[in-house]
Interface confidence: low
């Protein structure tokens, strides 16, 4: 008996060939001996089976002795043994129809679980192997689960169902709803304008939801809602914004926030959350702000940074074109009685400068100038 695997919703063509290369009488029946279709001379005739409106053949092939049965929009319950009767012979074909569906939705939030469920006919014992867009293989039986979806899991998942040494392939497009970056850090000198951008890693026709930026300033004991906003068909409208700081928000995607000026009291980390309509859970992006200030008070030249800095970052004070006078893995460095000239305060990571602030130290009889 020949075995053919089919996919739910797809079309399958079961072949039946006669030795005579001409149009002769044939019939296709199911295992209950109910006629599906056949011919009456050069006409196609259909029987009383449940496949009536979904069954067809190719009349153009009859003259060559080929009498296929085409079943459209396959259903799991179409799985059966189909019998072709031609020239006093019977050809049997076992059709097994499988379906593979993603749980609830193919648009899932980052961190959520993807469950793929295999629908299979009674009596079958298939195995399934899926390959994610990032090349990860998952094997299973009736269900396959992938927990903690990552951004790289967005794309086409290719799943192969194996039964009786035959295989059928499914392709499922999964969209992982997430921000492009899980976390970002902005380094700014005191007084500079700060731009926070929150690009999304997906595109959808209509995007509706609401969001909020909570901010935990390094100096504050508790976090604070800096801004709340709505998103309607990709249009952004601010609902509420604190007076200090007074953030500005772009009206279009990507989500874009502007802090008029970086100040030590704003240094810290924020969490932008976006709740999308008809989705449980939220998208998150962490954003960090590091602020630098260089000051000269009497005979003390000080450079300080505020905000979430890693312990491996180096803060140094140096006179332009000279070796660093002081370098420490700390958040404040200073030089007593600095000599006149242009001093640079540098925050660096393995030699790469992340933030720089210049301060001009004048001879002792005058006051400092900050360029």
């Amino acid at each position: 008996k020949k075995v053919v695997l089919g996919k739910k919703g797809d079309t399958v063509e079961l072949t039946c060939t006669a030795s005579q290369k001409k149009s002769i009488q044939f019939h296709w029946k199911n295992s209950n001996q109910i006629k599906i279709l056949g011919n009456q001379g050069s006409f196609l005739t259909k029987g009383p089976s449940k496949l009536n409106d979904r069954a067809d053949s190719r009349r153009s092939l009859w003259d060559q002795g080929n009498f296929p049965l085409i079943i459209k929009n396959l259903k799991i319950e179409d799985s059966d043994t189909y019998i072709c009767e031609v020239e006093d012979q019977k050809e049997e074909v076992q059709l097994l129809v499988f379906g593979l569906t993603a749980n609830s939705d193919t648009h899932l939030l980052q961190g959520q679980s993807l469950t793929l469920t295999l629908e299979s006919p009674p009596g079958s014992s298939p195995s399934v192997q899926c390959r994610s867009p990032r090349g990860k293989n998952i094997q299973g039986g009736k269900t396959l689960s992938v927990s903690q979806l990552e951004l790289q899991d967005s794309g086409t998942w290719t799943c192969t169902v194996l039964q009786n040494q035959k295989k059928v392939e499914f392709k499922i497009d999964i969209v992982v709803l997430a921000f492009q970056k899980a976390s970002s850090i902005v380094y700014k000198k005191e007084g500079e304008q700060v731009e926070f951008s929150f690009p999304l890693a997906f595109t959808v026709e209509k995007l509706t939801g609401s969001g909020e930026l909570w901010w935990q300033a390094e100096r504050a004991s508790s976090s604070k809602s800096w801004i709340t906003f709505d998103l309607k068909n990709k249009e952004v409208s601010v609902k509420r914004v604190t007076q200090d700081p007074k953030l500005q928000m772009g009206k279009k995607l990507p989500l874009h926030l502007t802090l008029p000026q970086a100040l030590p009291q704003y240094a810290g980390s924020g969490n932008l959350t976006l709740a999308l309509e008809a989705k449980t859970g939220k998208l998150h992006q962490e954003v960090n702000l590091v602020v630098m200030r260089a000051t000269q008070l009497q005979k003390n030249l000080t450079c300080e940074v505020w905000g979430p800095t890693s312990p491996k970052l180096m803060l140094s004070l140096k006179l332009e074109n000279k070796e660093a006078k002081v370098s420490k893995r700390e958040k404040a460095v200073w030089v007593l009685n600095p000599e006149a000239g242009m001093w640079q305060c540098l925050l660096s990571d393995s030699g790469q400068v992340l933030l720089e602030s210049n301060i001009k130290v004048l001879p002792t009889w005058s006051t400092p100038v900050q360029p």
């Epitope: 004991s221 976090s223 604070k224 809602s225 604190t242 007076q243 959350t273």
Partner: antibody, heavy 117, light 107 residues
């Protein structure tokens, strides 16, 4: 639309503890802070403390050591436990969504706690 | 702690009257001030946030002003449903503190 539903009235003896719950629905629970405010009979409003989205707490000095605020994200519920109760703790206890500068915009219906021997 | 002092503690007014309630902070709180309305047996309701911003759904007869230490809540034309107790609250720093309340009664 965010809604906060609190547990029912309680009668306690002095020295006992009370645990009031506040269940949130219709919003993104994990993204906002909740404050607890109490009101003694015929008196004004008194802030007790706040629990942040991360679970961090900030209590008013007056209640430090007697109050504990916790949150259970799986049930979208925040709890306020007050121990060593005395008669002056008789009050209506409210939970409220605290947006920081923009104030407490959503309030629970209140839970009356009576402390009496 | 920041002390909030409201005045008057109570007032009698008629429907249609213009009513003004003041709130004074013991230190500069910029505009971090909110106003609430509370009716007997009910939870407080946010009216004004950040000193002058009207909360969604609150009638436009309510308005707030002030900055620093002195703030005002004004009801331009008192309606029957406005008879209640009003509280100011600072959100400048913890502990958050409320004024003692102003009861608006029918004359």
């Amino acid at each position: 639309q965010v809604q906060l539903v609190q547990s029912g009235a309680e009668v306690k003896k002095p020295g006992a503890s009370v645990k009031v719950s506040c269940k949130a629905s219709g919003g993104t629970f994990s993204s906002y802070a909740l404050s607890w405010v109490r009101q003694a009979p015929g008196q004004g409003l008194e802030w007790m403390g706040i629990i942040n989205p991360s679970g961090g707490t900030n209590y008013a000095q007056k209640f430090q050591g007697r109050v504990t605020m916790t949150r259970d994200t799986s049930t979208s519920t925040v709890y306020m436990e007050l121990s060593s109760l005395r008669s002056e703790d008789t009050a209506v206890y409210y939970c409220a969504r605290d947006l920081g500068d923009p104030g407490m915009d959503v309030w629970g219906q209140g839970t009356l706690v009576t402390v009496s021997s | 702690d920041i002390q909030m002092t409201q005045s008057p503690s109570s007032l009698s007014a008629s429907v249609g009257d213009r009513v003004t309630i003041t709130c004074r902070a013991s230190q500069d709180i910029s505009n971090y001030l909110n106003w609430y309305q509370q009716k007997p047996g009910k939870a407080p309701k946010l009216l004004i946030y950040d000193a002058s911003n009207l909360e969604t759904g609150v009638p436009s007869r309510f308005s707030g002003s002030g900055s620093g230490t002195d703030f005002t809540l004004t009801i331009s034309s008192l309606q029957p449903e406005d008879f209640a107790t009003y509280y100011c609250q600072q959100s400048y720093s913890t502990p958050l503190t409320f004024g003692q309340g102003t009861k608006v009664e029918i004359k």
